[in-house]
């Protein structure tokens, strides 16, 4: 009977029905497991740890974008428990390739040492 329930559902013994696992709120992630018919007795939601965020539901908390360290960009908006960080323009000494599709992270800045002549962010 349990296996008839979906990914985020548990089998409710009282009603004999599949029931939605309680979704977490923004800034929280599931603690222990719930789904496919079973629910851990102590299943619940816990706040995201530092430097991570979640939009809620059944998502685990994810690390904020590292604008400066990974993307070599300025921080437009720092992340909090509910929102990812937003990156701004490239750091000094870095530039963004024009007319290039953004990757899954949105943007990456490249060192001016590799820039073509007259790249505006690298002039001067």
């Amino acid at each position: 009977e349990y296996s008839n329930c979906g990914e985020n559902e548990y089998y409710n013994q009282t009603t004999g029905l599949c029931q939605e696992c309680p979704p977490c709120g923004p800034g929280e992630e599931p603690y222990l497991s719930c789904g496919y018919g079973t629910k851990d007795e102590d299943y619940g939601c816990v706040p995201c740890p530092a430097e991570k965020f979640s939009k809620g539901g059944y998502q685990i908390c994810r690390r904020h974008k590292d604008c400066e360290g990974f993307f070599r960009a300025t921080v437009l908006t720092p992340g909090d428990m509910e929102n990812d960080a937003e990156c701004g323009p490239c750091l000094p000494g870095y530039y963004m390739l024009e007319n290039r599709p953004r990757n899954i992270y949105g943007m990456v800045c490249y060192s001016c040492l590799l820039a073509p002549p007259n790249t505006k962010e690298c002039v001067g």
Epitope: E1, N4, C5, N8, Q13, T15, G16, E20, G57
Partner: antibody, heavy 118, light 108 residues
Amino acid sequence: QVQLKQSGPGLVQPSQSLSITCTVSGFSLSNYGVHWIRQSPGKGLEWLGVIWGGGSTDYNAAFISRLSISKDNSKSQVFFKMNSLQADDTAIYYCASYYGYYDWFAYWGQGTLVTVSA
Amino acid sequence: EIVLTQSPTTMAASPGEKITITCSASSIISSNYLHWYQQKPGFSPKPLIYRTSNLASGVPARFSGSGSGTSYSLTIGTMEAEDVATYYCQQGSSIPRTFGSGTKLEIK
């Protein structure tokens, strides 16, 4: 096949109680819940409560103080009782049930038109 | 409680026309818990679509359902005279179970 048949009075005096019986066939009351829903004249559908297969109940908070749902599994009967009826309780009262692991109203009784009037 | 808002409240359509009725929930509902019913005057409601997109037994294939989250819809691919009725959405996610206020479909 699955059937739900309702029996109960059509006329109830103000402040009196309403009793309706829903007799089911084609499934076991020990396995499935039976819901009660009403529809006031010209209005929409209002969920009142449910008795689950295991015998526990859930009620709409607006009716919890005057509503009681019980059952007799061996007779395949569910009993609905609402106290202290007033004119605005005039409605068609339905029992309904489901099958499978999700709670949708796959089967409905024929409805009992209840008029609250002196 | 979860409030379901249906639109439009009433509508008239010509035979052969495509009809869409929407149901908006006040909070997120998993698609497994949203259902649709058809009611004709003098009759009990009849199950139409369960779990968002599954046709109940005997329901013509011109009916379909879709949606997720807080936004769901019922579509009649080509309106027929026998489709004149009131349509209700319903959620089975939480207690109390709730219904939309209904959409009355008439024929032009």
